[in-house]
Interface confidence: low
């Protein structure tokens, strides 16, 4: 019964890019400018997303698909469908509420986005530090201290005071 009823529904014949116009005897009318319908049988068309301000248009709106936005240079997308633009920082920095700040000692960020992360603790894997970490780069772990030739030294970085993203104590 349900299937029969849907087959008799004139709106089910309206393709994407149109809407079933109740004001015009349920005929299929094209979506007005700046609107779209991505599926058939719709009774209204959705308003196109506008990429304004820090957003820029990656894909124009058509009668069958919404516009897609990305971010202007110096910003990157966050959230599903680029719902937000967040400021880029330099490598070795993280974004704070007051702008970009250098990573604290013992942490690094090798990207233009995201937070500073603690250097790897080589000693947890029984290894030594081959190359010291910087604000932009993690430490490079080498062979275990026992494997080092006599006279070679290793540097173990201190753990940062509080690691980013820690849950409250």
């Amino acid at each position: 019964f349900e299937r029969t009823r849907s087959l008799q529904d004139p709106c089910s014949n309206c393709p994407a890019g149109t809407f079933c116009d109740n004001n015009r005897n349920q005929i299929c009318s094209p979506c007005p400018p700046n609107s779209f319908s991505s599926a058939g049988g719709q009774r209204t068309c959705d308003i196109c997303r506008q990429c304004k301000g820090v957003f820029r248009t990656r894909k124009e709106c058509s009668s069958t698909s919404n516009a897609e936005c990305d971010c202007t240079p110096g910003f990157h997308c966050l959230g599903a469908g680029c719902s937000m633009c967040e400021q880029d920082c330099k490598q070795g920095q993280e974004l704070t509420k007051k702008g970009c700040k250098d990573c604290c000692f013992g942490t690094f960020n090798d990207q233009k986005r995201g937070i500073c992360r603690p250097w790897t603790n080589c000693s947890l894997d029984g290894k030594s530090v081959l190359v010291n970490g910087t604000k932009e780069r993690d430490v490079v772990c080498g062979p275990s201290p026992a494997d080092l030739s006599p006279g070679a030294s290793s540097v173990t970085p201190p753990a940062p005071a509080r690691e980013p993203g820690h849950s409250p104590q």
Epitope: E86, L95, K98, H166
Partner: antibody, heavy 123, light 106 residues
Framework: EVQLVESGGGLVQPGGSLRLSCAAS??????????VGWIRQAPGKGLEWLAL???????SYSTSLKSRLTISRDNSKNTLYLQLNSLRAEDTAVYYC???????????????WGQGTLVTVSS | DIQLTQSPSSLSASVGDRVTITCRAS??????LAWYQQKPGKAPKLLIY???NRATGIPSRFSGSGSGTDFTLTISSLQPEDFATYYC????????FGQGTKVEIK
């Protein structure tokens, strides 16, 4: 154990000023990543964030109260302060100090709160 | 400034009920939302941070969800000690709180 204890509340005349203190223990206000702030609550009303200061001294203020607020700290006493000028009846509230619980720097919550100090502005 | 709107403003429920409180942000705040519980005469207590992470010592009956502009706090089975006022708070751009939701005994 982290503790925050506010003081300095009481009865203040309209047009006057107040200086609240918040003594912190169990952590240092100057440790990297630490930030502490002030939040108030008028009687029977909701919470309103006022100001915050970072470990490196950076300050943030509520847009609507910025011109009347000053947040500061004394690292040697591990104490936070809030000065509020040109007081009005609507500034009557319990004033809380609280510690930020995140060092992820965008996206912060308050994990430890003081017990609050009541400020009454009345003639 | 980012505004947070909580709904409902108050609700009456019984012990054992499932309670849902919503918080809507005036603009996208990713997952940078926290929930607090406050009892009369006491300071607020952190329940949930980053939209869905329970703070230390918070019972599993409290859960949070959402991202962008719409967030939910759920108490799966209301206990006598849960009657209180609940606030959401965003930390995406400065800090703002919702107006609160009072959970009362039916």
């Amino acid at each position: 154990e982290v503790q925050l204890v506010e003081s300095g509340g009481g009865l203040v005349q309209p047009g006057g000023s107040l200086r609240l203190s918040c003594a912190a223990s169990g952590f240092s206000l100057s440790t990297g990543g630490v930030a502490v702030g002030w939040i108030r609550q008028a009687p029977g009303k909701g919470l309103e964030w006022l100001a915050l200061i970072d470990w490196d001294g950076d300050k943030s203020y509520s847009t609507s109260l910025k011109s009347r607020l000053t947040i500061s700290r004394d690292n040697s006493k591990n104490t936070l302060y809030l000065q509020l000028n040109s007081l009005r009846a609507e500034d009557t509230a319990v004033y809380y100090c609280a510690r930020e619980g995140s060092t992820a720097v965008v996206g912060d919550w308050f994990d430890y709160w003081g017990q609050g100090t009541l400020v009454t502005v009345s003639s | 400034d980012i505004q947070l709107t909580q709904s409902p403003s108050s609700l009456s429920a019984s012990v054992g009920d499932r309670v849902t409180i919503t918080c809507r942000a005036s603009q996208g705040i990713s997952r940078y939302l926290a929930w607090y519980q406050q009892k009369p005469g006491k300071a607020p207590k952190l329940l949930i941070y980053d939209a869905s992470n329970r703070a230390t010592g918070i019972p599993s009956r409290f859960s949070g969800s959402g991202s962008g502009t719409d967030f939910t706090l759920t108490i799966s089975s209301l206990q006598p000690e849960d009657f209180a006022t609940y606030y959401c708070q965003q930390g995406y751009s400065l800090w703002t709180f919702g107006q609160g939701t009072k959970v009362e005994i039916k």
